[in-house]
């Protein structure tokens, strides 16, 4: 490439270029000037830049740096944003299916328990969804509430269907008996373990993806220091003052400037690496009871087994509960 | 035992679900995401170099700009002058990160700690001889990681059933489910394919 022509004797070309950034010709000298007031593009000889032009170039440098950062992170940002949205939607679908499977199980196997069972199942899976999205709900409480609500219905509809209406106010007693007598065996505890482990992992996975987006957004919109702005201006725009629009910065010089400007950003590197490796470790462990898809879509089966367990022990239970809750109107069993 | 939906009998007919070997599951999608993320593991350390390589710098040109003047690209002067008068470059590095960067580093530290805490402990052994408290011995113990339930024939094999792209969308109207005595999930005709989860490359 031929050497660039000597600087424009009239600053005409500099004006044309600067005009695109700042319409109006007021800031560009007609002919080269000493430029003694310049603070960034310190001239070795006459210059076509003014102090105002320097300021505009500094603003342009910062904007350009922001653009370069944003285009550098575009692919990464898109990857995480898309996946966060896709996984969130997929988890919601899993929850919806799990609810439908459970409702179908009740409808097919225990029609007498509907529609109350549908209501309790619906509330449980609503809480599951809210938990995944970060709500401050206790998983054990969710599971306990499901079984506490189900047992009175199971008792009055399946185990004691002939119970007179007058006896239907023993629900509180039955809820208490459910826990103390472990009427569902260890199934509630099992479900608590599985659901809490799988949901915790799912929740932290989504939180981690959303934080990933926040990290990139933060570095995308960093406001660079004045010193950095001056360094960038020197590298990218000071040549314009000499009428040298097409010259490029020396490669090593660019690296020095960028490392200086991004010293703070580069400090994220250690934690970013750790973030990706920790996320990988989490994902590698997301199987069996740590996989909410696996756990939630199998819940209907475990709930079914827990009801069968109650039915299997119905004789003993009915006798015990009959004694415990016989006078529940006077003395609520706790 | 209550079987996973794929194995259920509905109206004495087996619910058939087509198996497509390469279908994408949530877990395969998670692994794919991690692989892609790992290609960005050096993103922040590589950023200065990336920006220089993606903005005009002298490559084939004989002359380049060193901040003050045009110099020969390979001359010592180019390197030397590029380094000096760089507005307290050392001081710039000494200042430390901006408050927003410090904040985001703190958030990363916190999530990393959570992720490590959450990561599944290695080498969990499956204990098949766990007694259940209550009225009768059962299948699963207090903290049995792998037991998904299922009485009678031991542990139930749970398949990763929810396909990611060709998903079994059981958008069920429960009133349509037949009230037979076998445990069941929706009927064949209630299986629709879910399409609007885009495949991100």
């Amino acid at each position: 490439q031929p050497p660039p022509p000597p600087p424009d004797a009239t600053c005409h070309q500099v004006r044309s270029f600067f005009q695109r950034l700042q319409p109006g010709l007021k800031w560009v000298p007609e002919t080269p000037v000493p430029g003694s007031d310049l603070q960034v593009c310190l001239p070795k000889g006459p210059t076509c830049c003014s102090r105002k032009m320097e300021e505009k170039y500094q603003l342009t440098a910062r904007l350009n740096m922001e653009q370069l950062l944003q285009s550098a992170s575009m692919e990464l940002k898109f990857l995480i944003i898309q996946n966060a949205a896709v996984f969130q939607e997929a988890f919601e679908i899993v929850v919806r299916h799990a609810k439908n499977y459970t409702n179908a199980m009740f409808k097919n196997n225990y029609p007498s328990l509907t529609p109350q069972a549908f209501e309790f199942v619906g509330e449980f899976f609503t809480d599951v969804s809210l938990y995944i999205l970060g709500s401050d709900i206790n998983v054990d409480d969710m599971v306990n509430e499901l079984f506490d609500s189900l047992f009175p219905v199971i008792y009055t509809q399946l185990m004691n269907p002939g119970l007179p209406d007058s006896a239907l106010d023993i629900n509180e007693c039955l809820r208490g008996a459910r826990r103390d007598l472990k009427v569902f065996g260890n199934f509630p505890k099992l479900i608590m373990t599985q659901v809490s482990k799988s949901l915790q992992v799912t929740r932290i996975f989504l939180q981690a993806l959303n934080l990933g987006i926040e990290v990139i957004n933060t570095t995308d919109h960093l406001k660079f220091s004045k010193d950095c702005g001056r360094m960038l201006t020197r590298m990218w725009y000071c040549s314009y003052c000499q009428g040298l629009m097409m010259v490029k910065p020396c490669g090593g010089y660019c690296n020095v400037v960028m490392q200086g400007c991004m010293a703070g950003v580069v400090e994220i590197d250690k934690y970013w690496r750790e973030y990706i490796l920790s996320l990988e470790e989490l994902v590698n462990g997301m199987y069996r009871i740590y996989d909410m898809e696996n756990v939630l879509l199998g819940l209907f089966s475990t709930i079914h087994d827990s009801i069968q367990y109650v039915q299997k022990n119905a004789g003993k239970l009915t006798t015990t509960i009959g004694k415990l809750c016989a006078h529940s109107q006077q003395r609520q069993y706790r | 035992s209550a079987y996973y939906p794929e194995d259920l009998f509905i109206d004495k007919k087996v619910l058939k679900v087509a198996h497509v070997e390469h279908e994408e599951t949530l877990s395969s999608r998670r692994r794919e995401l991690i692989q892609k993320l790992k290609s960005f593991i050096s993103f922040y350390s590589a950023l200065p170099g990336y920006i220089c390589s993606h903005s005009p710098v002298a490559e084939n040109d004989t002359l380049c700009w060193n901040g003050q003047e045009l110099v020969e690209r390979y001359s010592q002067k180019a390197a030397r002058n590029g380094m000096k008068n760089q507005f307290n470059l050392h001081e710039l590095k000494m200042k430390g990160p901006e408050p927003v960067v410090s904040q985001i580093i703190d958030k990363l530290k916190h999530i990393n700690q959570l992720l490590r805490t959450m990561s599944v402990p290695k080498g969990r052994v499956l204990d098949k001889n766990l007694d259940e408290e209550g009225f009768e011995s059962g299948d699963c113990g207090d903290d049995e990681d792998e037991c998904i339930g299922g009485s009678g024939d031991g542990m139930m094999k749970v398949k990763n059933q929810l396909r990611f792209l060709a998903e079994l969308a059981y958008d069920l109207d429960v009133d349509d489910v037949p009230g037979n005595n076998q445990q069941a999930t929706p009927k064949d005709n209630e299986i629709s394919t879910f399409h609007n989860l885009g495949n991100v490359h």
Epitope: H12, L21, T60, L63, M74 | -
Partner: antibody, heavy 118, light 105 residues
Framework: EVQLVQSGAEVKKPGSSVKVSCKAS????????ISWVRQAPGQGLEWMGG????????NYAQKFQGRVTITADKSTSTAYMELSSLRSEDTAVYYC????????????????WGKGTT | ETTLTQSPGTLSLSPGERATLSCRAS???????LAWYQQKPGQAPRLLIY???SRTTGVPDRFSGSGSGTDFTLTISRLEPEDSAVYYC??????????FGQGTK
């Protein structure tokens, strides 16, 4: 790959105004510079003006000063050219074109063009 | 005001021949800011050459540009039938900001 899609053909009465749009896809719109060039039937190319969306600053050729307004909407990646006080000699194909830039400064070469609006 | 004059107005040649198109500026133009465009009927212009002599991506190497100061040339070494078009030169950086030549057909 950057593409510029222009709005459809317009028929206007003398004295009225016309607003032509140019939607960009691919790349980072805010860091482009967009120029508008027109071509009367059987004639050559004539630069009307240009804008750098990130600055919102527009420049106009002397001939069109006061009659043309070039704007850009970063949120929709769309540039607009409005020409007022239309006369019969304004009958032409109006092109939008992306200008090559170095560090946000347009270098004057138009490397991507819309298909034109008549 | 800088004007660009292109010659000849029309050039009739056969495939395989060499075409030489001229562009003359009324004032000296920096070679960094002179471009050549090709326009086929019913199509938008296409950038061929920038900075007087640099080819853009995808432009065949039979197209070459040269010149400095006030005289610039576009050469098509071996003409192909698809090279039939109008060619415009354009300068940037002098008032008015952008100027096109009238074109060579």
């Amino acid at each position: 790959e950057v593409q510029l899609v222009q709005s459809g053909a317009e028929v206007k009465k003398p004295g009225s105004s016309v607003k032509v749009s140019c939607k960009a896809s691919g790349g980072t719109f805010s860091s482009y510079a967009i120029s508008w060039v027109r071509q009367a039937p059987g004639q050559g190319l004539e630069w009307m003006g240009g804008i750098i969306p990130i600055f919102g600053t527009a420049n106009y050729a002397q001939k069109f000063q006061g009659r043309v307004t070039i704007t850009a909407d970063k949120s929709t990646s769309t540039a607009y050219m409005e020409l007022s006080s239309l006369r019969s000699e304004d009958t032409a194909v109006y092109y939008c074109a992306r200008e090559w830039q170095q560090q946000l400064v347009p270098l004057g070469y138009m490397d991507v063009w819309g298909k034109g609006t008549t | 005001e800088t004007t660009l004059t292109q010659s000849p107005g029309t050039l009739s040649l056969s495939p395989g021949e060499r075409a030489t198109l001229s562009c003359r500026a009324s004032h000296s133009v920096s070679s960094n800011f002179l471009a050549w465009y090709q326009q086929k009927p019913g199509q938008a212009p296409r950038l061929l050459i920038y900075a007087a002599s640099s080819r853009t991506t995808g432009v065949p190497d039979r197209f070459s540009g040269s010149g400095s100061g006030t005289d610039f040339t576009l050469t098509i070494s071996r003409l192909e039938p698809e090279d039939s078009a109008v060619y415009y030169c354009q300068q940037y950086g002098y008032s008015p900001l952008y100027t096109f030549g009238q074109g060579t057909k």
